[in-house]
């Protein structure tokens, strides 16, 4: 899919008034400096393209996030604000139905969440110059 | 404008299945999860559960996980809820509920008129 | 499972009255994921105010909501006819999604 054409102010907006609240009740008890941020993305639709690959694509180690509340506020958003997102999603859900456990919060989940955290902040940031 | 219209009140059988529909207008169907939720008379609100029609992705109240199923038709944009082995307990108003985002926070923010379901033999 | 139990379970209140409504949570949630319904007999629920404060379209500015973590509240600063009412907190933090038991308010 491609997110060029998304509003990113309102998924934006939807970010920082719930889904990275929800972010932050699944790192609960985990210290911010123990995951160094690995993954990166260079503007707003890579950033996009990014979190969607991690919040739903299942990885070894951990399974599937797609369950999870803040998983579940980000395809809504995504859905909402990226015109055609909804019909670009059906095999990848049909896929992962047969894997999915919910709240197994595995350390490669936490570390996973983590690096979404990240590529959401430079979400946030389209202006500044990659690292 | 955003609409939710549910079918009609329905008298059903102990053990008996019945199929309740919510037909929506005014967004778009696909990119938006639908609800249920279930009043007794005289009681309080109970999530059953929630149905994503873009890819048919559900998610139940483990209470309702073998009592509803959820379903969805995009060429009708209308969700489905059937609720199987009716006993008494199961007599209730059943609402549809839109989820979105207000104010950019979560919530169910447009509901149906609810169907009233009652079983009785 | 998240409860949420709302107090008192029912009320009455005379016009012009200042009126407060309870939501206490069982274990700590974020202000944006704790929502308020109006539902009037014979009625669908409508929303009343999302994320602890916001009010939904059309909610008149005589009520207000606050909170956090385990405890929340609606308020009317003075109770109309048109206030009685049964209002339910609900919570969006985590699965299964759960209501308080609602609170009736009567007028007097």
């Known amino acids: 899919y491609d997110f060029t054409n998304c509003d990113f102010e309102k998924i934006k907006a939807a970010y920082l008034s719930t889904i990275s609240k929800d972010l932050i009740t699944y790192m609960s008890g985990t210290k911010s400096t123990e995951f160094n941020n690995t993954v990166s993305c260079s503007n707003r639709p890579h950033c996009l393209t990014e979190i969607q690959s991690l919040t739903f694509n299942p990885t070894a180690g951990c399974a599937s996030l797609a369950k999870e509340m803040f998983a579940m506020k980000t395809k809504a958003a995504l859905a909402i604000w990226c015109p055609g997102y909804s019909e670009t999603q059906i095999n990848a859900t049909q896929a992962m139905k047969k894997r999915r456990k919910r709240k197994v919060t595995t350390n490669k989940c936490l570390e996973q969440v983590s690096q979404l955290q990240g590529l959401w902040r430079r979400f946030n940031r389209p202006l500044l110059k990659q690292q | 404008q955003v609409q939710l219209q549910q079918s009609g009140a329905d008298l059903v059988r102990p053990g008996s299945s019945v199929k309740i529909s919510c037909k929506t207008s005014?967004?778009?169907?696909?990119?938006?999860?639908m609800n249920w939720v279930k009043q007794r008379p005289g009681q309080g609100l109970e999530w059953i559960g929630q149905?994503?029609?873009?890819?048919?992705?559900?998610n139940y109240n483990g209470k309702f996980k073998d009592k509803a199923t959820l379903t969805a038709d995009k060429s009708s944009s209308t969700v489905y809820m059937q609720l199987s082995s009716l006993t008494s307990e199961d007599s209730a108003v059943y609402f549809c509920?839109?989820?979105?985002?207000?104010?950019?926070?979560?919530?169910?923010?447009?509901w149906g008129q609810g169907t009233s379901v009652t079983v009785s033999s | 499972e998240i409860v949420l139990t709302q107090s008192p379970a029912l009320m009455a209140a005379s016009p012009g009255e200042k009126v407060t409504i309870i939501c206490s949570v069982s274990?700590?949630?974020?202000?944006?994921?704790l929502h308020w319904y109006q539902q009037k007999s014979e009625t669908s629920p409508k929303p009343w105010i999302y994320?602890?404060?916001n009010l939904a379209s059309g909610v008149p500015v005589r009520f207000s909501g606050s909170g956090s973590g385990t405890s929340y509240s609606l308020t009317i600063s003075s109770m109309e006819a048109e206030d009685a009412a049964t209002y339910y907190c609900?919570?969006?933090?985590?699965?299964?999604?759960?209501f308080g038991s609602g609170t009736k308010l009567e007028i007097k």
């Open positions: 274990s700590s949630i974020t202000s944006s994921n």
């Open positions: 609900q919570q969006w933090s985590s699965f299964p999604l759960t």
């Open positions: 509920a839109r989820a979105g985002y207000s104010d950019y926070v979560y919530a169910m923010d447009y």
């Open positions: 994320g602890t404060s």
């Open positions: 005014g967004f778009a169907f696909s990119s938006y999860y």
């Open positions: 149905i994503y029609p873009g890819d048919g992705e559900t």
